[in-house]
Interface confidence: low
């Protein structure tokens, strides 16, 4: 971009650094100092006043940092005047055309649309801008600018090309790339290449989205790696690259793209729940309360667009009401209000529960914690303060089986006068017909029954949802409706509790924090053991992890807390997955005693599932009509499989497979195929054969013939037959060709020579070879053959051995014609 000098270099003092840029300078300064003096970065007392101005309309000003060219000299600055830069190097205009510091990518594909890049509806048009500010601080050179504007939702940032002759004269390079996208979007970067030398530094900072908001360091070179993804939760990101001399590394290439920011997941109100349609702008969060609680505040919140999207109001709360009348009651709950607050320390709450005519009420005491001296709970069978008392906390123990009204109403009165201990009350009511038992209830569990009407004789069996256990544990986990005259259950309902620790050996399940979904209490040390079948691993999915500061969940990769630590999880955490290396996983949750922090510490929900080990080669089926043996029980690297076939079957493929380092098999698994051919019967000596089929399949023939002078002994034709078991077989043995002529007599040994093998008779077709002693040469045929006939004859006379006439050694042993 050919800009004028005045557009880049401001008048001295004309720019005042913003709070954000001051903070950036401090942050960069601190981060670079941490690298230590061996990198050539030293603390300095002054800040370089040089400010590189971004293009018109932009306000980002990033001060450069103190630098020293050699230890102990203090910071050197470059004086700036309105007319240019003093120094012995090239003048500024020669440096204004930058090397390609940033490049725009190809147009984004429809598969991954970026944010809108033009005005939409009534929105003001904005652009995505990269401001790259470079300050080069030496005694002899001018600042190098590597800036480029980008108006795309994604692109690349690359280190400057420093191969030019001008660049090689530079002493120190200092670039700040500022990526700016729409409000409501954040910036995600992926490191594609990163090859920096030790002296180079690359910092990634989440820029202040608005003036006065300080940038935050996301990563430095030592924390970055190729393939790594970082997200800035603001619409501004800064990349700060420094090199004290001409870079020796291969530089960097970083891909960036805008992503739509979202509202945080709204907190679940105590004693209630929240459901969210979408966390992005426009999405809604709807709140509702548990039975016995009323919603205080807005039922629905909307996620509003903005630099940081946020909900349009405060999270509502669920408050218990102090008294009231419940008409036509069927099923519900009454709970004590929180002490203090609107109701004050003293409470007098009166509830009237009225069921329909012909029905009675069962009141189940779910949670009761009353201060003996200051709290009192009374329940009356009837609808008035004068009805007969059936429970008085000052006189009676908490009824395990609950209370049953004689009439269709219950009157509940709670009195509390400045209790020393927190008040807790949760009563569950349910209306039922008079001639049957009330419907049993099990929070976090299932009730199965032999009679859904719960008439006398009905059995109700209890079981808990995954992650919960029956309390009291063990049998009986069933109760019976007894006594037709006055039906009632013969035992109390159990409770399902998220326990502190336990042994889990299901293929899949849940680990819950103690007392989930209630907050866990302080002073916990729980250990869970998760065990799946051997040869498997455990995939653990952290669904919810929201524990108090100081509390910790430790995952051990094995059986017991002495195993290797897989992860230590604290504080609120996003969803994540973890994988054990073997079939055992131990979880330990520690929450030290002490007063709980109000409003914090929901707990945790962890799902687990057994999965195949992925450090083994894939399972291979055993061959049909054969078997295989393995060198190891599990198919780990180096395992050798040896394949064999049953009789009558042949192996197609390699008989040995090895599990390789990349967890693939060295070859495809072989197969055992029924053998449908006879073995090659072979040729015969002194004869030849003709076959009806070269592969010798069942039904094919082989015919044998002998050479002249030989006669066939055996079957001339063989047929290949199949058999029920084993391999196919030939109908006969292979015949032989027998000589039908008399032999040749040994012609004798030449004088001064010898034969290879001395025999009296040689059969037709046999050959005889002659040699001469040293100093003699062979005259005639070296080899003669017995030709069949009547009589059989040698092909020629035996040779002679004569004294050698020459010194040629090649003629001493053998001769030719």
């Amino acid at each position: 971009l050919p800009l004028k000098e005045e557009e880049i270099l401001p008048e001295p003092g004309s720019e005042t650094p913003t709070v954000a840029s001051e903070a950036l300078a401090e942050l960069l300064h601190g981060a670079l100092l941490r690298r230590g003096p061996e990198m050539g970065y030293l603390p300095g007392s002054d800040r370089d006043p040089t400010l590189a101005t971004p293009p018109a309309g932009q306000t980002l000003a990033v001060p450069s940092l103190p630098r020293a060219t050699e230890p102990g000299t203090g910071p050197l600055t470059t004086a700036v005047t309105p007319n240019g830069v003093r120094g012995a190097g090239p003048t500024a205009p020669e440096l204004l055309t930058p090397p390609p510091g940033t490049t725009a990518p190809p147009p984004p594909s429809p598969a991954s649309p970026g944010p809108p890049l033009g005005p939409e509806g009534g929105e003001e048009e904005t652009t995505t801008t990269i401001i790259t500010t470079t300050t080069v601080t030496t005694t002899v050179t001018s600042p190098v600018l590597c800036n480029n504007n980008i108006s795309e939702g994604e692109g690349y940032v690359e280190s400057p090309d420093l191969g030019s002759p001008v660049s090689r004269t530079l002493g120190l390079l200092d670039c700040t790339y500022s990526i700016h996208v729409y409000p409501g979007y954040g910036i995600e970067i992926q490191v594609q290449t990163l090859n920096l030398s030790q002296e180079e530094e690359l910092l990634v900072l989440a820029g202040g989205g608005s003036p006065g908001l300080a940038p935050r360091l996301l990563a430095n070179s030592s924390m970055l790696g190729e393939g790594q993804v970082l997200r800035s939760p603001t619409n501004r990101l800064l990349l700060h690259f420094q090199s004290p001399r001409v870079p020796r590394g291969g530089g960097f290439r970083i891909h960036y793209q805008a992503y739509l920011l979202s509202c945080g997941f709204p907190p679940r109100p105590a004693h209630g729940d929240v459901s969210v349609t979408d966390l992005h702008p426009g999405g809604t969060a709807t709140f509702h309360c548990d039975s016995g609680y009323q919603l205080q505040g807005e039922e629905t919140l909307i996620c509003l667009n903005g630099t940081r999207p946020s909900w349009n109001g405060e999270t509502p709360s669920c408050m218990a009401s102090c008294g009231g009348t419940i008409h036509n009651a069927t099923l519900g709950r009454i709970v004590s209000p929180e002490p203090g607050g609107a109701v004050g320390p003293n409470l007098t709450c009166r509830w009237v529960i009225e069921a329909a005519e012909g029905r009675r009420l069962h009141l189940h005491f779910e949670r009761v914690s009353l201060d003996e001296d200051n709290d009192r709970l009374m329940v009356r069978s009837g609808g008035s303060p004068l009805s007969p008392v059936i429970y008085d906390s000052d006189m009676d123990d908490v009824p395990e089986r609950g209370l049953i009204s004689d009439a269709q109403s219950l009157y509940v009165e709670l009195l509390s006068e400045t209790p020393a201990n927190p008040l807790l009350l949760s009563l569950r009511f349910e209306a039922f017909e008079e001639d049957r038992c009330f419907a049993p209830f099990l929070a976090h569990g299932n009730v199965t029954t032999t009679d859904p009407e719960y008439r006398p004789g009905a059995l109700a069996t209890f079981s808990c949802l995954p992650g919960y256990a029956l309390e009291p544990p063990g049998p009986p986990n069933a109760i019976e409706c007894v006594d037709p005259t006055e039906p009632h259950w013969n035992d109390t309902e159990p409770a399902c509790k998220a326990m502190c620790g336990g042994e889990l050996s299901e293929p899949a399940g849940v680990v819950l924090s103690p007392d989930w979904p209630q907050s866990y209490s302080p002073g916990q040390d729980c250990v869970w053991g998760v065990h799946v079948q051997e040869e498997k691993r455990i995939l653990l999915q952290v669904e919810i992890l929201n524990v108090r500061e100081g509390d910790m969940l430790t995952l051990f990769d094995g059986d017991g807390p002495s195993a290797r630590v897989l992860a230590q999880l604290r504080g609120p955490q996003p969803r994540r997955r973890l994988l054990s290396s073997g079939p055992d996983l131990t979880l330990q949750f520690q929450a030290p005693p002490g007063p709980p922090n109000p409003g914090l510490g929901q707990g945790f929900v962890l799902h687990f599932k057994e999965v195949p080990r992925n450090d083994t080669c894939p399972e291979l089926p055993p061959p049909e009509w054969g078997w295989r043996t393995a060198s190891h029980g599990d198919l780990i690297r180096g395992t050798v499989l040896t394949y064999q076939c049953e009789p009558g079957y042949e192996l197609l493929g390699s008989d040995i497979l090895t599990c390789q380092w990349d967890l693939s098999w060295s070859a495809a698994p072989p197969a055992c195929q029924k053998i449908m051919t006879c073995a090659d019967p072979g040729e015969i000596a002194n004869g030849h054969r003709t076959a009806s089929d070269a592969g010798f399949p069942v039904g094919s023939h082989v015919q044998y013939r002998c050479l002249p002078g030989y006669s066939l002994e055996g079957a001339a034709m063989l047929t290949c037959y199949s058999r029920d078991t084993g391999t196919p077989k030939w109908s006969d043995r292979v015949p032989k060709c027998a000589l039908k002529y008399e032999p040749c007599l040994n012609p004798g040994v030449p004088e001064n020579g010898y034969q290879t093998l001395y025999k009296h008779h040689y059969q037709a077709g046999e050959s005889l070879r002659f040699f001469c002693y040293e100093g003699f040469e062979l005259i005639g045929e070296v080899t003669i053959t017995c030709v069949p006939g009547h009589p059989s004859q040698w092909t020629s006379q035996p040779p002679l051995c004569k004294v050698t006439q020459t010194t040629d050694p090649s003629r001493q042993l053998e001769g030719g014609n």
């Epitope: 997941f265 293929p507 899949a508 995939l539 669904e543 969803r575 599932k609 999965v611 195949p612 399972e619």
Partner: antibody
Framework: QVQLVQSGAEVKKPGASVKVSCKAS????????MHWVRQAPGQGLEWMGW????????NYAQKFQGRVTMTRDTSIDTAYLDLSRLRSDDTAVYYC????????????WGRGTLVTVSS | EIVLTQSPATLSLSPGERATLSCRAS??????LAWYQQKPGQAPRLLIY???NRATGIPARFSGSGSGTDFTLTISSLEPEDFAVFYC??????????FGGGTKVEIK
């Protein structure tokens, strides 16, 4: 090759039960969860639950709790879906689907069994 | 439970055109999303898992992207055999595992 072969179509009356089978071949049956997914005529897919063929452990969608039973016979590499108290809206194609082994998605599906519930 | 909403319900395109199918989750499911193709009278077939990984034997013209709540299945150039109904499925939270309502890709 890996395949799941399901039993043939069934016609049932409301209130009755149906048992669908799914025979696995070409892989180790006990090493992977088996899921059941149904699809009403002209509708989308609905997950019913899974069975661990190794242990017989199950996990059912809340909607089918109390009406569905998933079992298996490892001697013949077969999984079964039993749905009781049939209603007309249970008319659907019932698919068995092999778990991927790493996460809860399905890499092999049976061809489906049409169950028609009609009075 | 997590609700998946697919759009559009029907997509009318010609062979050779590019198809872009959307799936939106009611809450953040990271990248735990699978895509399936179902032809009339056939069982579904796995195309994509973990939002962007192609299943074995699936042609390169099928690609998946997205994370969090918004996901996209792209068919770069439609072949005649690609016309079918496509379903997304979240494999993040269970039970239950849930599917989208489906997008029908038909020949224009």
């Amino acid at each position: 090759q890996v395949q799941l072969v399901q039993s043939g179509a069934e016609v049932k009356k409301p209130g009755a039960s149906v048992k669908v089978s799914c025979k696995a071949s070409g892989y180790t049956f006990t090493a992977y969860y088996m899921h059941w997914v149904r699809q009403a005529p002209g509708q989308g897919l609905e997950w019913m639950g899974w069975i661990n063929p190794n242990s017989g452990g199950t996990n059912y969608a809340q909607k089918f709790q109390g009406r569905v039973t998933m079992t298996r016979d490892t001697s013949i590499d077969t999984a079964y879906l039993d749905l009781s108290r049939l209603r007309s809206d249970d008319t659907a194609v019932y698919y068995c689907a092999k778990d991927s082994g790493y996460d809860w998605y399905f890499d092999i599906w049976g061809r489906g069994t049409l169950v028609t519930v009609s009075s | 439970e997590i609700v998946l909403t697919q759009s559009p319900a029907t997509l009318s395109l010609s062979p050779g055109e590019r198809a872009t199918l959307s799936c939106r989750a009611s809450q953040n499911i990271s990248s735990y999303l699978a895509w399936y193709q179902q032809k009339p009278g056939q069982a579904p077939r796995l195309l994509i898992y973990d939002a962007s990984n192609r299943a074995t034997g699936i042609p390169a013209r099928f690609s998946g992207s997205g994370s969090g709540t918004d996901f996209t299945l792209t068919i770069s150039s439609l072949e005649p055999e690609d016309f079918a109904v496509f379903y997304c499925q979240q494999h993040s939270n269970w039970p239950p595992l849930t599917f989208g309502g489906g997008t029908k890709v038909e020949i224009k």
